[in-house]
Amino acid sequence: EEELQVIQPDKSVLVAAGETATLRCTATSLIPVGPIQWFRGAGPGRELIYNQKEGHFPRVTTVSDLTKRNNMDFSIRIGNITPADAGTYYCVKFRKGSPDDVEFKSGAGTELSVRAKPSAPVVSGPAARATPQHTVSFTCESHGFSPRDITLKWFKNGNELSDFQTNVDPVGESVSYSIHSTAKVVLTREDVHSQVICEVAHVTLQGDPLRGTANLSETIRVPPTLEVTQQPVRAENQVNVTCQVRKFYPQRLQLTWLENGNVSRTETASTVTENKDGTYNWMSWLLVNVSAHRDDVKLTCQVEHDGQPAVSKSHDLKVSAHPKEQGSNTAAENTGSNERNIY
């Protein structure tokens, strides 16, 4: 009689994560007597997957009834497959021995590959806010997919972006992979309502890409524009001066009125109005008692927006002149040091 052969007919088996893998194995003879064991990997570090004789293997079931005397089918099913199960599986016949069974013959091995979906992409933006016309970086990460081939695209408000760099790791063979991409986005004043989207397409997703989003409202800072105007006289000795704070984002804003450099009043923006583009407008007014001043008064509206250096706009109030409505024609004064805070 011919010597027993262990036949693993499948060189490779491909299974989707979460499914059951069937690993086929048959023996050509009932002799010698002895159990079958399944291992992942070869050599001394191999991992026992199933032992016909003893042990508890909750994820493994046999295709045939191994207790039947004439059984020569030693195929197994492994349930709830994950990428960690990938590897080469060997069906090994042992010969009954004393005290231990002796390895007799091994199958050629079956390589189990696992297809796994990428995780939902996570998009993160810069740690600090940036102002319009500046370029900011967004990163997108997705993990745990297999095979390695994957497509990543960036969009801003539905328009595809081209300035990005993507890496898939590791470079070599692995049971699963990760993708990391960095996109550069130029901010505009209209970006408060904008979204940046990272879209990942993979064969396992069957045409339904995964998307991660970031709202530019978390990233952008739109500095305010200031306008100081003198309103018509309320009484012969009173002048109403307003400071219009326009097109700012986020809402966090503190305004200080100064009369000839001395703090008159400080207030925090509360009842703001929202513009269509998501920015805010706010107005503060100051009632100046002209009769209390002998000389001309320099009124300054100083605004500290979102913790940035203050910007200010001044208005010269002529005490000698008969009070009438007049616009502000003085240049803005920037009490901060950063030119880009003035628009």
């Epitope: 491909l14 081939d149 339904d208």
Partner: antibody, heavy 119, light 110 residues
């Protein structure tokens, strides 16, 4: 048993329209990508279009504008609406289901339905 | 769009013969290649997917190999029920999704 059954084929005049159906049983259509493939008499296989599990459709360049794939999840049925039919659209039309591991292969096929475009 | 070139377009072989069919993609498709068997009047049947994986219920005499642009289907010992037409099919994505079939190889009895 997992099965696909096409229907709706027949004789149609050039310029006419036809709607093919593909009834699925043994699985939910909304969990797999589904493809339409056609085969002209004595010729090879040609993909027409595909629908993703969420209902997004993709078409072969030549099929865009004339052919529309849709799905009725409540009836577990896939459709192929064919308009402005030409003689060269004469073929057996197959629907097929993508594998669970991805939409690069198709492991369940219907028996096909013959569409003849002729005056 | 990607083109799949299958060869030969037909071949004659005897039962027990080893048969090899090749498929070439016009650009790299990684391992996204499937093989189907079709008998007259019947629907195609999946044999091999992802270049080398045997579909459920397919005899082990069928095997597939290759990656990139060149792929092979091998029938180690041709059986009477294997006389049929065989098609390769690719999946590819660049700017849009694309599935393409080869022209087919008819395996006839010698």
């Amino acid at each position: 048993e997992v099965q696909l059954v096409e229907s709706g084929g027949g004789l149609v005049q050039p310029g006419g329209s036809l709607r093919l159906s593909c009834a699925a049983s043994g699985f939910s259509l909304s969990t797999y990508a589904m493809i339409w493939v056609r085969q002209a008499p004595g010729k090879g296989l040609e993909w027409v279009g595909i629908i993703s599990p969420s209902g997004t459709t993709y078409y072969a360049t030549w099929a865009k504008g004339r052919f529309t794939i849709s799905r009725d999840n409540s009836k577990n049925t896939l459709y192929l609406q064919m308009n402005s039919l030409r003689a060269e659209d004469t073929a057996v039309y197959y629907c097929a289901r993508a594998g669970s591991g991805g939409w690069d292969y198709f492991n369940i096929w219907g028996q096909g339905t013959l569409v003849t475009v002729s005056s | 769009d990607i083109q799949m070139t299958q060869s030969p377009s037909s071949l004659s072989a005897s039962v027990g013969d080893r048969v090899t069919i090749t498929c070439q993609a016009s650009q790299s498709i990684s391992s996204y290649l499937s093989w189907y068997q079709q008998k007259p009047g019947k629907a195609p049947k999946l044999l091999i997917y992802y270049a080398s994986n045997l579909a459920s219920g397919v005899p082990s005499r069928f095997s597939g190999s290759g990656s990139g642009t060149d792929f092979t289907l091998t029938i180690s010992s041709l059986q009477p029920e294997d006389f049929a037409t065989y098609y390769c099919q690719s999946y590819y994505y660049s700017n849009n999704y694309n599935w393409a079939f080869g022209g087919g190889t008819k395996v006839e009895i010698k």
